[in-house]
Interface confidence: low
């Protein structure tokens, strides 16, 4: 028989966490499992409980996390790794479309996230949406292009700025910036 | 390479008690947990109870407040303390230890003991 499957590992109500924030980690098995494992990478922490249950996000906190569980004397496959983020580290960055928040179907657009810091990488999000814009010739610039705007992507937006140094200390969110496709 | 060794077992009557311990050497700086299991025959290995290195248990549902683990980290050893027994803890127990390596997952080690037979019956 093969390994047992992995679990799944999410944060609540998001894996972004301001500080003094209240989040929790779970990890789900399949029924009946014997015992969870929940460790936070490249340190000497884990617990033997499925849930972690933070009630003040700390610096110390951000960083990766990885759950396995155990049945019998089989360990499972570990979980996909979550990332756990402290926002409002650093003062927040300011958000701008070029050229401008109103934009016609098909025209093109750059939300831009400025900051006074050094910084060497941006995310931008869009409500809504699960994760950060991660492409890779995006991530790692304070300029986003959006080519060929559409419908979808009306809404509002919100930057983070971070250094590569600390990938999981993150600057507060920007001011949000809405953008209208007309 | 790590040596486990159990001791403790024998026959005895539904209600009665029993300690088992396991001695472990070699390279017992790796160990992060140690544990114990059991297997009945027929059935598949299971787990019972585990502790840390720091003294955290867990128990396996069946025997919560009628086994107790406890570890002397000095002597490298792990016990089993069990009370109450009952005719379905008829197995042979094994110890195991944990390993927590660097990077990677944590695993069982493949380093089991000879196990020591458990008999509850009256």
């Known amino acids: 028989s093969g390994p047992l499957p992995k679990p799944s590992l999410q944060a609540l109500p998001s894996s972004l966490v301001p500080l003094e924030k209240p989040v929790t980690l779970r990890c789900q098995g399949p029924p009946g499992v014997d015992l969870y494992r929940l460790e936070k990478l490249s340190s000497s922490r884990y617990q033997d409980q499925a849930v972690l249950f933070i009630p003040a996000m700390k610096r110390s906190l951000a960083g990766r996390y990885r759950c396995s569980y155990q049945n019998g004397s089989l360990w499972s496959l570990p979980s996909d790794q979550l990332e756990l983020v402290a926002t409002g580290v650093f003062a927040k960055p300011s958000l701008s479309a070029q050229p401008g928040p109103a934009v016609s179907s098909g025209g093109d657009v750059t939300l831009q996230c400025q900051t006074r810091y050094g910084f060497d990488q941006f995310a931008l999000y869009k409500e809504g949406d699960p994760a950060p814009y991660k492409n890779p010739e995006r991530w790692y610039r304070a300029s986003f292009p959006i080519i060929t705007v559409t419908a979808a992507h009306s809404g509002t937006y919100r930057c983070y700025s971070f250094s590569s140094r600390d990938p999981y200390l993150w600057s507060a969110p920007s001011d949000p910036l809405e953008l209208v496709v007309t | 390479q790590v040596q486990l060794q159990e001791s403790g077992g024998g026959l005895v009557q539904p209600g009665g008690s029993l300690r088992l311990a396991c001695a472990a050497s070699g390279s017992v700086s790796s160990i992060n947990d140690m544990g114990w299991y059991r297997q009945a025959p027929g059935k598949q290995r299971e787990f019972v109870a585990r502790i840390s290195r720091g003294g955290l248990t867990n128990y396996k549902d069946s025997v919560k407040g009628r086994f107790t683990i406890s570890r002397d980290n000095a002597k490298n050893q792990v016990y089993l303390q069990m009370n109450s027994l009952k005719p379905e803890d008829t197995a042979v127990y094994y110890c195991?230890?944990?390993?927590?390596?660097?990077?990677?997952?944590?695993?069982?080690?493949?380093?089991w003991g000879q196990g020591t037979q458990v008999t509850v019956s009256s």
């Open positions: 195991n230890a944990d390993f927590r390596p660097s990077s990677g997952t944590f695993r069982l080690s493949d380093y």
